[in-house]
Amino acid sequence: LTCLGGFASPGPVPPSTALRELIEELVNITQNQKAPLCNGSMVWSINLTAGMYCAALESLINVSGCSAIEKTQRMLSGFCPHKVSAGQFSSLHVRDTKIEVAQFVKDLLLHLKKLFREGQFN
């Protein structure tokens, strides 16, 4: 079990549940989006491979004052084994392309759903 009790439910949460909850939150963000997400803020694009959760957090944590993604940031921190702070890029190996937060969320969601369907929860 992965200990991800901080954002969803008390105590340890099965990895499949934690991933499902993250997917649900990203779905909610994309479906409830009316105005440009986070005022059209740009973030670093990431490689959706190993270390993806930390890289995603490192990218999104640099967006401040955007309540719509605060829960996502908290959830991602549960998947990342080390503490991440703004301006930290240890997992972001490639920093060459910036995309809007809305596109970042959509790309991340598609990938996470594929991982979930494949049964890759860790």
């Epitope: 499949s16 549940t17 499902r20 997917i23 649900e24 779905v27 479906q31 759903k113 594929k114 979930f116 369907r117 494949e118 049964g119």
Partner: antibody, heavy 123, light 107 residues
Framework: QVTLKESGPGILQPSQTLSLTCSFS??????????VDWIRQPSGKGLEWLAH???????RYNPALKSRLTISKDTSSSQVFLMLASVDTADTATYYC???????????????WGQGTSVTVSS | DIQMTQTASSLSASLGDRVTISCRAS??????LNWYQRKPDGTVKLLIF???KLHSGVPSRFSGSGSGTDYSLTIRNLEQEDIATYFC?????????FGGGTKLEIK
């Protein structure tokens, strides 16, 4: 209009391989978020999920039968196939195929079902 | 695997009645609960998904509720065409599992 129809051998002998075909219309397995499941129901017993296949060829199986099951698809002919190896009398059942969609949350809800095809394993 | 239990294997009711069919999961399935109707001719239809969302074309007399491990399907103003067997199914965790079914009969 979404429709699915199962076809199979009807009767086969123990130790043979069961081959089932699900022919569908009204949707495409080349479309994102689409999937097809196989479910069976032995006479007088409950429904048992067997396997599913997604548009991008991701496949999942019921662990209890995984070693004997193979699911595949032919997108161009709108067909999904299920093979069950080394059948026994316990595999006698009505076999259904059904569509599932994963847009939004992944509900794993089968929204359209075929009429089912009866399979009897007998020596 | 998650076990799904429908305690009533059969229910008898009169036309116009309100009928409730219950389903219990062996662990929390977080509202990923779907309901199906199987008619005597073998036709299977999805009625409700994600606990309470009505599938397209399903009459509004059908409704679903529940959370955690306990869920229910309610049919208001029972009609003759509702005579069928009703199955619950959890969609939270693979392998997908079904309840044993509740056969609805007319008094």
């Amino acid at each position: 209009q979404v429709t699915l129809k199962e076809s199979g051998p009807g009767i086969l002998q123990p130790s043979q391989t069961l081959s089932l075909t699900c022919s569908f219309s009204g949707f495409s397995l080349s479309t994102s978020d689409m999937g097809v499941d196989w479910i069976r129901q032995p006479s007088g017993k409950g429904l048992e999920w067997l396997a599913h296949i997604w548009w991008d060829d991701v496949k999942r199986y019921n662990p209890a039968l995984k070693s004997r099951l193979t699911i595949s698809k032919d997108t161009s002919s709108s067909q999904v196939f299920l093979m069950l190896a080394s059948v026994d009398t316990a595999d006698t059942a009505t076999y259904y195929c059904a569509r599932t969609v994963s847009s939004g949350y992944i509900y794993y809800a089968m929204d359209y079902w075929g009429q089912g095809t009866s399979v009897t394993v007998s020596s | 695997d998650i076990q799904m239990t429908q305690t009533a294997s059969s229910l008898s009711a009169s036309l116009g009645d309100r009928v409730t069919i219950s389903c219990r999961a062996s662990q929390d399935i977080r509202n990923y609960l779907n309901w199906y109707q199987r008619k005597p001719d073998g036709t299977v239809k999805l009625l409700i998904f994600y606990t309470s969302k009505l599938h397209s074309g399903v009459p509004s007399r059908f409704s679903g509720s529940g959370s955690g491990t306990d869920y229910s399907l309610t049919i208001r103003n029972l009609e003759q065409e509702d005579i069928a067997t009703y199955f619950c199914q959890q969609g939270n965790t693979l392998p997908l599992t079904f309840g044993g079914g509740t056969k609805l009969e007319i008094k």
